[in-house]
């Protein structure tokens, strides 16, 4: 689950960011890959590695310096120091701690000018969290009688998640029991005999299959659930693609 901030490529990648010098084409520094600089705010779990990049060009080849909170960033400013890979215009900090939080500015300069770019680093200390479900999933679906449909529930959980697919059902023509609670049927759940519990596939559907389908996910910390609706159309009607996805926001984190 370890994630590193900045782009994920290794410093052994083949994309060389150096621009060769040409005396007749002198030029102030410029950014060569702004896509790698778009993400300014980096929230990273403690103990992870952070890499900030400022790919630049210029003639003569510019130099790169790093500032922390507007001041020169020295090796002794953090335990374990940091690495600068000049050929990749990168700053690498391993095993970040809360004191590493702050603004990191790359200052790229040559005799014709200078440019700078600032990243903000937030070091997040980890706490156990309940499952997080991807917004918009499962998505509403429609199909004709006899058709097939698939609902997908994307789950993120550090701890082992238990996934259940639940549908509201009727008993003796009633949706609710004497206690006022709805009648629910577990259609599928994660376990030994269940393959890919994040997907609920329905085949050869009938009108009876129409209704609300709930993806309920629990771990030892708590629960989350989201639902989607299945519309079953008569055979002669073509399915209408749902434009709006309705997701219960109750458990979104």
């Amino acid at each position: 689950d370890a994630i590193s901030s900045g782009d994920d490529e290794d410093d052994t990648d083949s994309s060389e960011d150096f621009v060769s010098e040409n005396r007749s084409n002198q030029r102030a520094p410029y950014w060569t890959n702004t896509e790698k600089m778009e993400k300014r705010l980096h929230a990273v779990p403690a103990a992870n590695t952070v890499k900030f990049r400022c790919p630049a060009g210029g003639n003569p080849t510019p130099t790169m310096r790093w500032l922390k909170n507007g001041k020169e960033f020295k090796q002794e400013h953090r335990i374990g120091g940091y690495k600068v890979r000049n050929q990749h215009w990168s700053l690498i900090m391993e095993s970040v701690v809360p004191s590493d939080k702050g603004n990191y500015t790359c200052l790229v300069e040559n005799e014709y000018g200078s440019i700078n770019h600032t990243y903000h680093l937030d070091v997040v200390e980890r706490s156990p969290h309940r499952p997080i479900l991807q917004a918009g999933l499962p998505a509403n679906a429609s199909t004709v009688v006899g058709g097939d449909v698939e609902f997908v529930c994307k789950v993120y959980s550090d701890a082992q998640p238990h996934i259940q697919w639940i549908k509201h059902v009727e008993k003796n023509g009633s949706k609710y029991g004497p206690d006022g609670l709805p009648y629910l049927k577990v259609l599928k759940h994660s376990g030994i005999n269940s393959s890919n519990a994040e997907v609920l596939a329905l085949f050869n559907v009938t009108e009876m299959d129409a209704g609300e389908y709930i993806c309920k996910v629990s771990n030892y910390i708590g629960q989350a659930n989201q639902s989607a609706w299945l519309t079953v159309l008569p055979k002669q009607q073509a399915p209408v693609r749902e434009k709006e996805i309705t997701a219960s926001p109750d458990y979104l984190e």
Epitope: D1, P128, A159, Q160, S218, Y220, I221, G222
Partner: antibody, heavy 114, light 107 residues
Framework: QVQLVQSGAEVKKPGSSVKVSCKAS????????MHWVRQAPGQGLEWIGA????????SYNQKFKGRATITADKSTSTAYMELSSLRSEDTAVYYC???????WGQGTTVTVSS | DIQMTQSPSSLSASVGDRVTITCKAS??????VAWYQQKPGKAPKLLIF???YRYTGVPSRFSGSGSGTDFTFTISSLQPEDIATYYC?????????FGQGTKLEIK
Amino acid sequence: QVQLVQSGAEVKKPGSSVKVSCKASGYTFTSYNMHWVRQAPGQGLEWIGAIFPENGDTSYNQKFKGRATITADKSTSTAYMELSSLRSEDTAVYYCARGGFDYWGQGTTVTVSS
Amino acid sequence: DIQMTQSPSSLSASVGDRVTITCKASQDVSTNVAWYQQKPGKAPKLLIFSASYRYTGVPSRFSGSGSGTDFTFTISSLQPEDIATYYCQQHYSSPYTFGQGTKLEIK
């Protein structure tokens, strides 16, 4: 800040019941499981069960199934653990703990003695 | 139920020592293991969860590793305040079982 405050010590007779409360504050009570764990004198930790207050879903250690009942009152952000048919072996400190076992109550000593 | 077998049950070490406690699960629990510290008369404190994630505010001398059935908890440099009993716990499936504990003493 997150706090779990448990009810006071109890002395009970064998065969009777005890109900321990755990009042939560400083976080959204309904968003996390509430676990109950006990520790007999000089012994290790034993998980009793848990409740998800939002919908009342419970999970129990089979060892306590039928004797332990865990409930939650959303209006007061309080969880309860009731243990019936008490015997001397139930003498222990009973703890409530938030979902990730990251916050614990101070413990409630239950003594079962004739 | 998943059994958690912790060893040793007690150990004596000097300040500054590296201390290692192990826990073995009776079945694969992936990385769903937590470690707690408990001092006499106090509630347990969460140190490590999901096998290797150090909980907020826990000193960096405490670390955890392992997956599957074998797990290790390490104190890199023992401090006087680390004298306590340490427990492992699996949070893979209910019931969430604990190891029997390791009592750590200063030599």
